[in-house]
């Protein structure tokens, strides 16, 4: 048993039929010694008396809020949550496996630049009685500070018969140098509590590996005289690290017809302009990627040919 | 410890091309190592991230762009002395700071070159003959060092009398390639910045 926060404790249980459970000793937080009684939840049924209460925790019915009283007055509470371990593996019932980039990916994180700010998100099909808290650090043995905000519900989607809820959190490394070479990964830890079930999820990454620039901005077309060609120009996204001559991007320019089956013409360039042939009803899209470290491409910025 | 913004020179940057080749070569070599050593811990998640240049050079700090010198988190640099007669910029306007930066890059390359050559010698003794260092990568390191054109004492190749542990050597190779790729990215950024300055 360990303390998650004040008056909230997590009991780790091997979860299998007829498991013996865990013996837990609760102590009433009071200077009083005599006349103390214990109840579970809002029940008036007395479970025991004395400053300590010993219980065998086997299932969710044994979890909940234990309260010690004296003469009708509440002295203290202890909320017990369960963390299930089945076949040696901690349960992952609360969050959905996103399966990207690999199986058992529950947390996904992205950064728009090298400033040390990043966003993580996760999915669940649970919509009520759910709380998350997020902690992060650079490295684990001698952790350096990363500050995370509160997790918030960022999107709701319908997936077949199910509704899916996306939560996200923003974190910022306390003292980040954009030019630094990372040798210790960022660790992100999410505590998830659904009712009386506790689970924790972790992710470990280097900022350089989760970079995904915003799409190029100010995408414009300039027709070239007496030609079907156009000059496409764009700018670095505002959110990208500066100076741009140090944090350089490379770009992919695509000409795509109305039909998905039509052949796509693609050009790769380090410049912020390109000359392409603009077909009728086609659209021109540009996306960006770090020029030197191949992390994710940005989403496309698009403009119609006409 | 920052790069001044110099006026562009007509005889600009022979090093940019070489640094781009270097990044391409080390990335290809790392990919090859990951594929060939698929049953070894060779991915970024599996290896320990070690920097053989730590406390010997300070390339990141010495080559910091002017715009980042206001960022206090970037300025916890280590004092290191460098030989400062580089000739990568065709012009004679190479400032002390830029020379410090380029000589730091040169020292990095020299250290990695020695490590890679030592390692290759061990790998050539492996009866499995599973993996060797790409000669192209070693050549590209050499070319960039020549383009930087610093005079520096040659570091003797480390030789070892004991029988090499090939498993350890291959893991060390992965560690070295990951670290060198990260340094090659920094070098490329620096050269791009200098080229634009």
């Amino acid at each position: 048993i360990w303390e998650l926060k004040k008056d909230v404790y997590v009991v780790e249980l091997d979860w299998y039929p007829d498991a013996p459970g865990e013996m837990v000793v609760l102590t009433c937080d009071t200077p009083e010694e005599d006349g103390i009684t214990w109840t579970l939840d809002q029940s008036s049924e007395v479970l025991g008396s004395g400053k300590t209460l010993t219980i065998q925790v086997k299932e969710f019915g044994d979890a909940g809020q234990y309260t010690c009283h004296k003469g009708g007055e509440v002295l203290s509470h202890s909320l017990l949550l369960l963390h299930k371990k089945e076949d040696g593996i901690w349960s992952t019932d609360i969050l959905k496996d996103q399966k990207e980039p690999k199986n058992k990916t529950f947390l996904r994180c992205e950064a728009k630049n090298y400033s040390g700010r990043f966003t993580c998100w996760w999915l669940t099909t649970i919509s009520t009685d759910l709380t998350f808290s997020v902690k992060s650090s650079r490295g684990s043995s001698d952790p350096q500070g990363v500050t995370c905000g509160a997790a918030t519900l960022s999107a709701e989607r319908v997936r077949g018969d199910n509704k899916e809820y996306e939560y996200s959190v923003e974190c910022q490394e306390d003292s980040a140098c954009p030019a630094a070479e990372e040798s210790l990964p960022i660790e992100v830890m999410v505590d998830a509590v659904h009712k009386l079930k506790y689970e924790n999820y972790t992710s470990s990454f280097f900022i350089r590996d989760i970079i995904k620039p915003d799409p190029p901005k100010n995408l414009q077309l300039k027709p070239l005289k007496n030609s079907r060609q156009v000059e496409v120009s764009w700018e670095y996204p505002d959110t990208w690290s500066t100076p741009h001559s140090y944090f350089s991007l490379t770009f992919c320019v695509q000409v795509q017809g109305k039909s998905k089956r039509e052949k796509k013409d693609r050009v790769f360039t380090d410049k912020t302009s390109a000359t392409v042939i603009c077909r009728k009803n086609a659209s021109i899209s540009v996306r960006a990627q770090d020029r030197y470290y191949s992390s994710s491409w940005s989403e496309w910025a698009s403009v119609p040919c006409s | 410890r920052n790069l001044p913004v110099a006026t562009p020179d007509p005889g600009m940057f022979p090093c940019l091309h070489h640094s781009q080749n270097l990044l391409r070569a080390v990335s290809n070599m790392l990919q090859k190592a990951r594929q060939t050593l698929e049953f070894y811990p060779c991915t970024s998640e599996e290896i320990d991230h070690e920097d053989i240049t730590k406390d010997k050079t300070s390339t990141v700090e010495a080559c910091l762009p002017l715009e980042l010198t206001k960022n206090e988190s970037c300025l916890n640099s280590r004092e290191t002395s460098f030989i400062t007669n580089g000739s990568c910029l065709a012009s004679r306007k190479t400032s002390f700071m830029m020379a410090l930066c380029l000589s730091s890059i040169y020292e990095d390359l020299k250290m990695y070159q020695v490590e890679f050559k030592t390692m290759n010698a061990k790998l050539l003794m492996d009866p499995k003959r599973q993996i060797f260092l790409d000669q192209n990568m070693l050549a590209v390191i050499d070319e960039l060092m020549q383009a930087l054109n610093f005079n520096s004492e040659t570091v003797p190749q480390k030789s070892s009398l004991e029988e090499p542990d090939f498993y350890k050597t291959k893991i060390k190779l992965c560690i070295l390639l990951h670290a060198f790729r990260i340094r090659a990215v920094t070098i490329d950024r620096v050269m791009s910045y200098l080229n634009a300055s």
């Epitope: 579970l40 809002q42 019915g61 649970i126 919509s127 009520t128 009685d129 | -």
Partner: antibody, heavy 120, light 107 residues
């Protein structure tokens, strides 16, 4: 002793707004982990959950009725109020309030219910 | 929303019989299922929470089991006072939903 008691009009006209009050005793609406739900039951039919409010004001609504419902509480009066706009004859039902706590997460105490008929 | 399909709708049994009611959720609801008893003219009473936990003061002839999508409620030895409608309810997901109910009648 924990008790909940619903009160409100017996009859409402179509399109009118229904306001129901749940007055609780034996526990405080401001106690951490305390919550109250509203549930209704049309004559001879199954139960339907409408809305829930927690001690800290956080609330949940049944999405199919969300646009018509508002749940609120007045801790000093130990009351939880549910308003339902644009009433229709199909909303004729017995309306219950029930306590649901963040300890056993079950509706462990129910009021006796108040019957509301929607008719012109 | 999660549909709780409760079977059977009606049960006619003799005192002393064993009774089993099932509830099937349209998607997994973990163990977040409660069972209620509603006697004629009364409000519902909580019997079981977390699928298998008997609420305070509930006789031990009432038991619940199940996880995921399939849940069972059992009265081991029916007594005359058990005449009531029994409902299952999930609160894994909003909207919290109830089964259609099982009316238990005693011969």
């Amino acid at each position: 002793e924990v008790t909940l008691k619903e009160s409100g009009p017996v009859l409402v006209k179509p399109t009118e707004t229904l306001t129901l009050t749940c007055t609780v005793s034996g526990f405080s609406l401001s106690t951490s982990g305390m919550g109250v739900s509203w549930i209704r039951q049309p004559p001879g039919k199954a139960l339907e959950w409408l809305a829930h409010i927690w001690w800290d004001g956080d609330n949940y609504y049944n999405p199919s009725l969300k646009s018509r419902l508002t749940i609120s509480k007045d801790t000093s009066k130990s009351q939880v109020v549910l308003t339902m706009t644009n009433m229709d004859p199909v909303d004729t039902a017995t309306y219950y309030c029930a306590r649901r706590t963040r300890v056993n997460y079950a509706m462990d105490y129910w009021g006796q219910g108040t019957t509301v008929t929607v008719s012109s | 929303s999660v549909v709780m399909t409760q079977t059977p709708k009606f049960l006619l049994v003799s005192a002393g019989d064993r009774v089993t009611i099932t509830c099937k959720a349209s998607q997994s609801v973990s163990n977040d299922v409660a069972w209620f008893q509603q006697k004629p003219g009364q409000s519902p009473k909580l019997l079981i929470y977390y699928a298998s936990n008997r609420y305070t003061g509930v006789p031990d002839r009432f038991t619940g089991s199940g996880y995921g999508t399939d849940f069972t409620f059992t009265i081991s030895t029916v007594q005359a006072e058990d005449l009531a409608v029994y409902f299952c309810q999930q609160d894994y997901n909003s909207p919290w939903t109830f089964g259609g109910g099982t009316k238990l009648e005693i011969k």
